[in-house]
Interface confidence: low
């Protein structure tokens, strides 16, 4: 290997003494891991992000990097430290031979190493002649400032900042970290280089076709003239934003990442850190007609991930591909034939399509919401985006069958007004990854740090599951679902809510073995029931006769099969009131639903009696859905009888607080 930085002998001598003073060994029993992009063509071998353990100081990062250089030099390899990370993640970016990975993984403080990989702009086409009108523009809710209290960072291509649409609205930072363009005959043409970023800046804050016309933007160049960048370049860009935020704290920050690469642990980790520093990140779900969980930053739970729909509420098709989908998508937004600034001239407009355009819409909506309510947390903003979305308008037939239940049927919209949202009890449904089919496999669904887990349910397409339960993990409740022998796997489904000053706990009753079934209630003073879960160890929960009935006058209890343990989620929060609502169908039916009324929010969704022909229960917006096996396989026996149980809550405290504010 060669290195531009000088003579090999000199480097060895310089680093030999450095290494001698570094004798710390890696902590006993901990092994660092190596990660690389699952998509071979996107891999960039030879460049690696070495991520160090969380509490590592900058000085230790620098010493670890130098130590790697010294040890590599001893073995006859030259390495080049391209960047030392601090501010978001501790670590460094190194150019080296893959032969050195084993050595690098044994260095002190190393958590994991990730091979660099490519990321791509998520729009097509680059320059389109056909121009169509905006598919989406701000509805009647338009604060006079239109997002003026918010700064939106755009990590993208270079932009044409003197375009009439965005002139004076976008500050081009001096940040640039892009790979060389592919191909020897590539000619850099300013209008092509600026195309993607200029268009997106226009969609976010353009004078005519922008969503948040008052928002100011800052652009960082992380994509080259072909719309290609790297994970490492994006990481350094995110670090730049964090450092800017620390140096000069301003109002709310929104970061738009209209790009996607393969799943990246390090990119997701950086996004998580930035989100936890109070920054709202919005990203494209990806244009691969695939599960968004296979891409980054789309798969990062802390990021608001946006899929694309068209004016007919169809998921957007892009050539042979189209919008990504699945549980990692938070919501959809217009992403087909979106009008925005064209870099062909300072007054030109062009239409582009893709999840980048959809993400830009949501970044604009987020800027508007944050401008109206600057104190909103990321969790509050996400819940509001979901709450104000158009529900159940997307034609789900476009998605693969196994993804339909996991994909949110939500299209972003601006709230009708800035008032009236404060009293709402906001909840959302979070699906886990699939557990896999092994006998003891489990799946875990988690809420965001400032959300409360109010209920937990499970779902299996085969019906072979052993229920679910809420359990404490790292000081927070999580929802865990259990696969059963012969099952194809399960999903855990968490109902995550914003409930300030809540004190929640789980009360469990072991299997009763009595004919009346198992019951558990919220016995603490002032605690109300928000959700019921049941979990069983037996492989097949038999038909339960007599049927499980909820005793009258005891709404605050969960009931279930006598062979199952029952878990009640019990919460105390100012003004919280809940009620149980049931819908039973005596004859077998593939789907039974029950919805909460206007003003009430669904917090819990479960099935009675929970026998093996029930595939599971999950919440869709404010409706509890219980799915059963195909009617034809069940027969019209009493086993076919299923009841959907919804727990509906509201908060008088939040309502009062919002009235006092108005």
């Amino acid at each position: 290997q060669e290195d531009e930085d000088g003579d090999y002998e000199e480097l060895v001598l310089a680093l030999r003494s450095e290494e001698d003073g570094l004798a710390e060994a890696p902590e006993h029993g901990t092994t660092a891991t190596f990660h690389r992009c699952a998509k071979d063509p996107w891999r960039l071998p030879g460049t690696y992000v070495v991520v160090l353990k969380e509490e590592t100081h900058l000085s230790q990062s620098e010493r670890t990097a130098r130590r790697l250089q010294a040890q590599a030099a001893r073995r006859g390899y030259l390495t080049k430290i391209l960047h030392v990370f601090h501010g978001l993640l501790p670590g460094f970016l190194v150019k080296m031979s893959g032969d050195l990975l084993e050595l690098a993984l044994k260095l002190p403080h190393v958590d994991y190493i990730e091979e660099d990989s490519s990321v791509f702009a998520q729009s097509i086409p680059w320059n389109l002649e056909r121009i169509t009108p905006p598919r989406y523009r701000a509805d009647e809710y338009q604060p006079p400032d239109g997002g003026s209290l918010v700064e939106v960072y755009l990590l993208d291509t270079s932009i044409q900042s003197d375009h009439r649409e965005i002139e004076g609205r976008v500050m081009v930072t001096d940040f640039e970290n892009v790979p060389e363009e592919d191909g020897t005959r590539f000619h850099r043409q300013a209008s092509k280089c600026d195309s993607h970023g200029t268009h997106l800046a226009g969609v976010v804050s353009g004078r005519d076709a922008g969503v948040a016309k008052g928002a100011s933007m800052r652009s960082l160049r992380v994509l080259n003239c072909q719309g290609k960048g790297t994970v490492s370049g994006t990481l350094i860009g995110l670090e730049f934003i964090r450092k800017s935020q620390l140096v000069q704290p301003v109002g709310p920050l929104v970061v738009l990442l209209p790009l996607a690469g393969g799943y990246s642990r390090v990119l997701n980790a950086a996004c998580q850190r930035l989100a936890r520093a109070g920054v709202v990140l919005v990203t494209a779900a990806g244009n691969f007609r695939d599960d968004a969980c296979l891409y980054s930053p789309a798969s990062a739970p802390e990021v608001i991930t946006v899929g694309a729909t068209n004016a007919q509420d169809q998921p957007v098709t892009l050539g042979t591909l189209g919008t990504n989908f699945g549980r990692c998508v938070d919501l959809f937004a217009p992403g087909e034939d979106i009008i925005g600034a064209s870099s062909d001239c300072s007054t030109c407009f062009v239409s582009q399509s893709g999840t980048s355009q959809a993400a830009a819409h949501v970044a604009g909506i987020a800027a508007m919401m944050l401008s109206a309510e600057p104190e909103l947390t990321l969790a509050e903003l996400r819940q509001r985006l979901i709450h104000f979305s158009a529900k159940d308008v997307i034609n789900e037939a476009w998605f693969p069958e196994d993804q339909r239940v996991l994909t949110p049927n939500l299209v972003a919209a601006l709230p009708p007004s800035t008032h009236g949202a404060g009293w709402q009890l906001f909840c959302r449904t979070v699906w886990s990854a699939h557990s896999g089919p092994t006998r003891m496999a489990t799946a875990v669904a988690r809420c965001a740090p400032d959300e409360e887990l109010l209920s937990c349910s499970s779902f299996s397409r085969s019906g072979k599951r052993r229920g679910e339960r809420m359990e404490a993990q790292g000081g927070k409740l999580v929802c865990r679902a259990h696969n059963a022998f012969g099952g194809e796997g399960v999903y855990a489904i968490a109902r995550c809510c914003l409930l300030p000053q809540a004190n929640c706990s789980v009360h469990t009753a072991p299997p009763a073995e009595a004919s009346m079934g198992t019951r558990v209630h919220c016995h603490q003073q002032g605690h109300v029931l928000t959700g019921c879960s049941s979990h069983w160890e037996v492989e097949d929960l038999g038909t339960h006769k007599p049927p499980v009935l909820r005793p009258r006058g005891q709404p605050n209890q969960c009931v279930g099969h006598r062979e199952a343990s029952i878990h009640a989620s019990c919460c105390h929060a100012p003004g919280l009131e809940c009620k149980v609502k049931e819908h039973g169908i005596p004859a077998p039916q593939e789907q039974v639903t029950v919805a909460c009324e206007e003003g009430w929010t669904l917090t819990g969704c479960s099935a009675l009696p929970g026998t093996s022909h029930v595939l599971g229960a999950y919440a869709v917006d404010n409706t509890c859905v219980v799915r059963s096996r195909d009617v034809s396989t069940t027969g019209s026996t009493s086993e076919g009888a299923v009841t959907a149980v919804a727990i509906c809550c509201r908060s008088r405290h939040l309502a009062q607080a919002s009235q006092e504010l108005q």
Epitope: P133, P134, R137, D139, Q142, A311, Q312, D313, F349, V393
Partner: antibody, heavy 123, light 108 residues
Framework: EVQLVESGGGLVQPGGSLRLSCAAS????????MGWVRQAPGKGLEYIGI???????YYASWAKGRFTISRDNSKSTVYLQMNSLRAEDTATYFC?????????????????WGQGTLVTVSS | DIQMTQSPSTLSASVGDRVTITCQAS??????LAWYQQKPGKAPKLLIY???PLASGVPSRFSGSGSGTEFTLTISSLQPDDFATYYC??????????FGGGTKVEIK
């Protein structure tokens, strides 16, 4: 006072052409989409087409090819060029201004209308 | 092309009546629907846009509702000035602009 005034209507023979104008006063047309709508005697409203603020035009499928909308922002005027006219094109032609960008989700909700100009196609 | 179907085509009512006109779209148009009032020899007047918000200067006795394919215009208490023809109009993207056939509200 905000006003749209259509002109250029009249009697024309089948197969003939006519150019209607819509002049605006009291508003800057350049930042709005402008549409044309017609109404045959005793009948309902029929959408013809729209021109958005930065130039592109869109037409009802029946109007494509025969009707052309254009604008001259310096004169604050929008035009409707009608070719190969037929008897069934006899109608009052209205020009209308789109609701401002902040209020409607899509182009085509019209909140300011002209008084209309009558076009009669007859031999 | 999108089709907008209005019903009824004619409606006889008296002053003070509550009047409801419905409009059906041949495909989902979200809430991109407007309602207009037109009097003989006059240009149409925008009453409602985006399915429910009132255009400026429109009395509050007018209200609109619906989304997707089914929409309703309601006049809570018919006034003498309200006898006219009412049109619904879809504007869900440039290729989906179309008017309904109209509903004439006449004196009973």
């Amino acid at each position: 006072e905000v006003q749209l005034v259509e002109s250029g209507g009249g009697l024309v023979q089948p197969g003939g052409s006519l150019r209607l104008s819509c002049a605006a006063s009291g508003i800057d047309l350049s930042s709005y989409a402008m549409g044309w709508v017609r109404q045959a005697p005793g009948k309902g409203l029929e959408y013809i087409g729209i021109i958005v603020s930065y130039g592109p035009t869109y037409y009802a499928s029946w109007a494509k090819g025969r009707f052309t909308i254009s604008r001259d922002n310096s004169k604050s005027t929008v035009y409707l060029q009608m070719n190969s006219l037929r008897a069934e094109d006899t109608a009052t032609y209205f020009c209308a201004r789109d609701l401002d960008a902040q209020s409607s989700g899509y182009y085509g909700a019209f909140n300011i209308w002209g008084q209309g100009t009558l076009v009669t196609v007859s031999s | 092309d999108i089709q907008m179907t209005q019903s009824p085509s004619t409606l006889s009512a008296s002053v003070g009546d509550r009047v409801t006109i419905t409009c059906q779209a041949s495909q989902s148009i979200s809430t991109a629907l407007a309602w207009y009032q037109q009097k003989p020899g006059k240009a149409p007047k925008l009453l409602i846009y985006a399915a429910s918000p009132l255009a400026s200067g429109v009395p509050s006795r007018f209200s609109g509702s619906g989304s997707g394919t089914e929409f309703t215009l309601t006049i809570s208490s018919l006034q003498p000035d309200d006898f006219a023809t009412y049109y619904c109009q879809s504007y869900y993207g440039s290729s989906n602009i179309a008017f309904g056939g109209g509903t004439k509200v006449e004196i009973k």
